[in-house]
């Protein structure tokens, strides 16, 4: 930014334009620059107790330039003030104060919290939720047949994250008990919702085949852990038959 | 609260003379370069002068140079316009205002009208 | 000197509606532009500087944007008390110069 800053030079006179440096157009011993070349601006530096002109290719930090007929001037933003419009108006604070309509202050106001990032006051945002989806199947570990009671889920969306001081979301997704008239799976069903099945780990002797809900594959050699599954199955058919509610759902 | 209040408009005859005054309050009247816009009836926003802040310069649209003259006293706190040679085209509402790139603070205006 | 060029000249439209004015620099302004309200009878109210910062105290419904050239006024949900003439000025450079305003009317 401080590009083509303005040296002084010794034994000028003032109006003289012969032999100024760095961008100016006249200077003087005392007071360095008195004006620019075209296109930069000048600003007036306080060093100790005289004060400089310089030229410059834009304005340093903490001033704003204004574009005159006849000359390019800089003038100094607010104390606090990095960027500034003009003297009402800033655009940037200096560190540790935050910028909220064109002030600089220390805190934000009421209602009100400091982006840490932009240093600006800006407005509490609340977090938004879409409405819920519906809900899901009954389902019971993962699965949508070969149960009586499972869990039904419904999600929504977070349409707006809050800031650092506004309303923390609400839960996302909800799961509720429900209870429906048994469905046998049928051959080959898994009724899965993408996960594969856990297989258990074969005994010696047993075969690798996945034990089956209902007439699935069976091996070869039946098993006392199959021979059971088969006993279930057939008290579970009796027990369907003499339920007459279909699809009672209750949350919990 | 800052004021900015115009007096001295009117009706005078072509080639006549006014002189517009404008009182400043509430705000540093000495930092501030300070302007005239006028707006003539049913038209749009026009700049006429502005003088920096301490007085040193003055900057005039070419449709009044040499006739109007933009002076300021800041022990006073307050900005003139001396209106020369007046002209038809010179009827319209004359604003002062706090001219600091944007026009940040505005007087209620004083109005001009040139007729014979 | 820098030309403004805004448009509409005039907008009729409704309580509630979202009205965009554009304004139009002859050369690259960078975001050196202000808009200013003005009711009849009244002094201009400035509304924005910096091309899209907004004055203390006027409504959120207000924005600015554009950088360069091309700029734009937009109010979200038009109020009654929006019904008023519209101007930007260039604050880039001497000699000062608004925009021929727009006259936004009640339809």
């Known amino acids: 930014q401080n590009a083509s800053r303005g040296r002084r030079q010794r034994r000028m006179h003032p109006n003289v334009s012969q032999g100024c440096q760095g961008g100016c157009a006249t200077c003087s011993d005392y007071n360095g620059c008195l004006s620019c070349k075209p296109r930069l601006f000048f600003v007036l530096e306080r060093i100790g107790m005289k004060q400089i002109g310089v030229c410059l290719s834009s304005c340093p930090s903490g001033y704003y330039g204004t574009r005159y007929p006849d000359i390019n001037k800089c003038t100094k933003c607010k104390a606090d003030c990095d960027t500034c419009f003009n003297k009402n108006f800033c655009t940037k604070c200096k560190s540790g104060f935050y910028l909220h309509l064109g002030k600089c202050l220390d805190n934000c106001p009421e209602g009100l919290e400091a982006n840490n990032h932009t240093m600006e006051c800006v407005n509490i945002v609340h977090c938004e939720v879409s409405e819920w989806n519906p809900w899901s199947p009954c389902t019971k570990k993962g699965k949508t047949c070969g149960f009586k009671r499972g869990t039904e889920t419904r999600v929504r969306e977070i349409m707006q994250h809050p800031s650092a001081k506004g309303n923390l979301c609400p839960p996302t997704n909800e799961t509720r008990k429900c209870t429906v008239q048994r469905k046998k799976c049928q051959k080959g069903e898994r009724g899965k919702k993408g996960r594969e099945r856990k297989r258990k780990k074969p005994n010696k002797g047993e075969s690798k085949e996945a034990i089956p809900d209902s007439k699935g594959l069976e091996s070869s050699k039946e098993t006392p852990e199959q021979r059971e599954n088969k006993q279930q199955q057939k008290k579970r058919k009796v027990q369907d038959k003499q339920q007459k509610s279909v699809s009672v759902s209750t949350v919990h | 609260e800052v004021q900015l209040v115009e007096s001295g408009g009117g009706v005078v005859q072509p080639g006549r003379s006014l002189r517009l005054s404008c009182a400043a309050s509430?705000?540093?009247?000495?930092?501030?370069?300070m302007a005239w816009v006028r707006q003539a009836p049913g038209k749009g926003l026009e700049w006429v002068a502005t003088i920096i802040y301490d007085g040193s310069r003055t900057y005039y649209r070419d449709s009044v140079k040499g006739r109007f003259t933009i002076s300021r006293d800041n022990s006073k706190n307050t900005l003139y316009l001396q209106m020369n040679s007046l002209r038809a085209e010179d009827t319209a509402v004359y604003y002062c205002?706090?001219?600091?790139?944007?026009?940040?603070?505005w007087g209620q205006g004083t109005m001009v009208t040139v007729s014979s | 000197d820098i030309q403004m060029t805004q448009s509409p000249s005039s907008l009729s439209a409704s309580v509630g509606d979202r009205v965009t004015i554009t304004c139009l620099a002859s050369?690259?302004?960078?975001?050196?532009l202000v808009w200013y309200q003005q009711k009849p009878g009244k002094a201009p109210k400035l509304l924005i500087y910096a091309a899209s910062r907004l004055q203390d105290g006027v409504p959120s419904r207000f924005s600015g944007s554009g950088f360069g050239t091309d700029f734009t006024l937009t109010i979200s949900s038009l109020q009654p008390e929006d019904f008023a003439t519209y101007y930007c000025?260039?604050?880039?450079?001497?000699?000062?110069?608004f925009g021929q305003g727009t006259k936004l009317e009640i339809k």
């Open positions: 050369e690259d302004i960078s975001n050196d």
């Open positions: 205002a706090a001219h600091d790139r944007s026009f940040d603070y």
């Open positions: 509430g705000f540093t009247f000495s930092d501030y370069d």
């Open positions: 000025q260039q604050s880039y450079k001497y000699l000062p110069t």
